[in-house]
């Protein structure tokens, strides 16, 4: 028998520095977690103790903090090189700055193979990107060879900016021939490493003949065997065992997100490359693990540029940006409108001639808007200003919901109106009318939504049975502020870009902004 240790991360999302327990900015260092310096300590400890170790990343290193905003992926290549990752799969967020924003900072600088078998380049891009990412890589590990085959969510064109010259094929269809090829070349230990979410990971384990282990990402899935060490609730045991269609037991793993855990899986293979056993657990990277001093020193050196960036002007406002709780928790506020407009603008994807865009709607809990911005400071807006408005380090995500769920969400928005509670919704691409004289749960008297399958966008009444795409904060997607119906009834959830980054990009693009209160949210006469 031959034993392999797989160390894995996924959805790190720019958390190069240690973070608080909820993966936001580290405040009390003695209770902080993760970060590349701490990760390196643990990885090196395991590499020294065990003979056959692979360090793998399942995508979405890009996007999530000011580190990515400023360094645009150069930080990913630099620190992943320093940690000596063995391979990485492309995630959807790796395309957030377009193909060029992937090629230059990461693909050309990474000193580890970057993989995806289901992304095919065409047209002029084919020769430009040739060899910069691979469908698979065969790695020598100890006295054996291991094949790593990559995959990426085929939804990426709707979630990011890969352009028109990359085709995202069905994962299973693309993986099978690559695995078959490796088998014919006597590579009998194969890991599928990719970024399509836990459901697809399980399908790959079930359907792709010859895959021995699946290491996934995208869905931020936390798996654990035994008592979990922090706040995350396990979605299943680690590893999650799938019985393949040809009768094999295939371990599937994922390691939550944000570099909080290091996935640790031990696999035992027989001489024919069959998995005999698999066991392990994610390792919580808490403060009991010291940060490596040399990596930490490097982080501090790179940090300097971030502090300078925070105070630079992104753009100007010529109006007061009302982000006060007195406004945003009671009525339409122009800060809410600005943020929602930025959220939609960030998700413009012309992937189908029938649609002007794939999504037109935004909802945003008023309680998530934490500060106004005064225009009387020469109109200047900085990252620092935006960090005061959106201090929680969240993301603006894409969900699919039925109209009936949206209706429930808007009823919840005003079910206890007047108490300055955070669930009051700010909107974009939606016209809502409330009648507060009616009883809670029956206060939405009009709900019109902007069409997507149209050449001239207009507002139509919400249809209860129709499925709609909506951009919203991850906080709401996860049922925050009492929006349990969203969490329970959503049909799809893809995590998006860092909230501050979305707004800052929009302001930089617009240069001068003047959001108004324009009647997106109304109250019936006599009721307010």
């Amino acid at each position: 028998a031959w034993e392999l240790t797989i160390l894995h991360t996924n959805d790190v999302h720019s958390r190069l520095e240690q973070t608080s327990e909820d993966s936001s900015k580290c405040v009390n260092a003695s209770r902080c977690m993760g970060g590349v310096a701490r990760l390196f300590t643990k990885v090196q400890q395991i590499r020294r103790a065990e003979p056959n170790v692979l360090l793998l990343d399942a995508g979405d290193q890009y996007q999530g903090t000011i580190w990515f905003t400023v360094y645009k992926g150069a930080e990913v290549a630099h620190f992943m090189n320093a940690l000596r990752y063995d391979a990485m799969a492309l995630g959807n967020h790796e395309f957030d700055n377009g193909v060029e924003g992937l090629i230059e900072p990461l693909l050309k600088e990474a000193k580890f193979p970057i993989l995806s078998a289901n992304i095919k380049a065409k047209g002029p891009l084919a020769s430009q990107i040739s060899g910069l990412y691979l469908p698979y890589k065969v790695l020598p590990v100890g006295d054996e060879v291991v094949g790593i085959v990559g995959y990426t969510s085929k939804e990426t064109p709707f979630l990011s900016n890969p352009g028109t010259n990359l085709v995202f094929e069905d994962e299973i269809t693309a993986l099978q021939p690559e695995v078959d090829k490796l088998k014919t070349l006597n590579v009998n230990k194969i890991i599928a490493l990719g970024h399509s979410g836990f459901e697809m990971d399980k399908l790959i384990a079930q359907k792709v003949r010859g895959v021995d282990v699946v290491v996934g990402g995208h869905s931020n899935t936390f798996l654990y065997t035994g008592n979990p060490p922090s706040k995350e609730v396990p979605a299943g045991k680690y590893p999650f065992i799938v019985t393949s269609d040809d009768g094999r037991k295939v371990p599937v793993v994922q390691a939550y997100a944000f570099g909080k855990y290091l996935g640790y899986l031990k696999i035992e293979f027989d001489e024919r490359g069959n998995v005999i056993s698999s066991h392990g657990n994610p390792i919580l990277l808490n403060s009991s693990i010291p940060e490596d001093p040399s990596i930490k020193a490097d982080i501090n050196k790179w940090r300097i540029k971030l502090d300078n960036y925070s105070t630079q002007e992104l753009g100007k406002t010529i109006v007061y940006l009302d982000g006060s709780s007195q406004s945003c928790r009671f009525r339409e506020c122009n800060m809410g409108n600005l943020i929602c407009d930025a959220m939609i603008n960030n998700n413009l994807r012309h992937t189908d001639e029938m649609f002007w865009n794939h999504v037109s709607m935004c909802i945003l809990n008023g309680g998530g808007i934490r500060s106004p911005i005064d225009e009387r400071n020469n109109g200047t807006i900085t990252w620092e200003n935006l960090a005061a408005v959106l201090p929680f380090g969240g993301t603006f995500d894409l969900v699919q919901l039925k109209g009936s769920t949206l209706k429930k969400a808007f009823e919840h928005s005003v079910h206890r109106y007047g108490q300055s509670t955070g669930e009051f919704l700010q909107v974009g691409g939606i016209h809502v009318v409330y009648d507060l004289s009616r009883k809670p749960g029956d206060r939405v008297v009009k709900l019109d939504v902007l069409c997507t399958k149209c050449r001239v966008p207009s507002y139509d009444p919400l249809k209860m049975d129709e499925v709609y795409k909506v951009i919203l904060p991850n906080f709401l997607a996860n049922g925050g502020d009492g929006f349990q119906m969203i969490k329970d009834e959503l049909l799809r959830h893809d995590s998006g870009d860092q909230d501050i980054n979305v707004v800052s990009t929009y302001i930089s693009k617009m240069k001068v902004i003047y959001p108004a209160v324009e009647g997106r949210i109304k109250f019936s006469t006599g009721s307010h």
Partner: antibody, heavy 118, light 107 residues
Framework: QVQMKQSGAEVKKPGASVKVSCKAS????????MDWVRQAPGQRLEWMGD????????IYNQKFKGRVTITIDTSASTAYMELSSLRSEDTAVYYC???????????WGQGTLVTVSS | DIQMTQSPSSMSASVGDRVTITCKAS??????LSWYQQKPGKAPKTLIY???RLIDGVPSRFSGSGSGTDFTLTISSLQYEDMATYYC?????????FGQGTKLEIK
Amino acid sequence: QVQMKQSGAEVKKPGASVKVSCKASGYTFTDSNMDWVRQAPGQRLEWMGDINPNNGGTIYNQKFKGRVTITIDTSASTAYMELSSLRSEDTAVYYCARTNWDYAMDYWGQGTLVTVSS
Amino acid sequence: DIQMTQSPSSMSASVGDRVTITCKASQDINSQLSWYQQKPGKAPKTLIYRANRLIDGVPSRFSGSGSGTDFTLTISSLQYEDMATYYCLQYDVFPRTFGQGTKLEIK
């Protein structure tokens, strides 16, 4: 700068063994695998095997059917290639070559001529 | 094992010429191809890896291209010091295999 310095030429009888050394300098020895390649007179280059200096893990070309053994001494930043049961067709120049992150050979030793003759 | 076939086996060209050497793999090798230059009595020198990535310090007149099974080494403007034998190597899978070499002479 990266350098690989190999041991000197050897003359061996058929059936004997030869051990060639390769001392690396100018980089962290454990950061890169080491490959061994040979070239018989007038022939193409032929890959023999690979070693990982971190754990001594080796992968060999099956053509050499257990005749080749690659080892390392990390404290001396040195790799060794031993070929046993020598025959006349093993007369060749033997090269060590460091591999880069992509496992492609990038820096080569100067070569060691091994002559097998009765 | 994967077979690597180079063409031509030998060629001669003049200083300043554009020179192209091809290498064909018996199956798709996933861009895992490198090129080496060997002068008589010397160790090989690596020029290119991953089909098109130039090794640091190699003159920019050398370039690599290709994918799948067909690869090309191009010298944009031949120099006298480029007289050598050139080898391709596939390192996609084990065992690594070399082409038979292309001997380049100066007219």
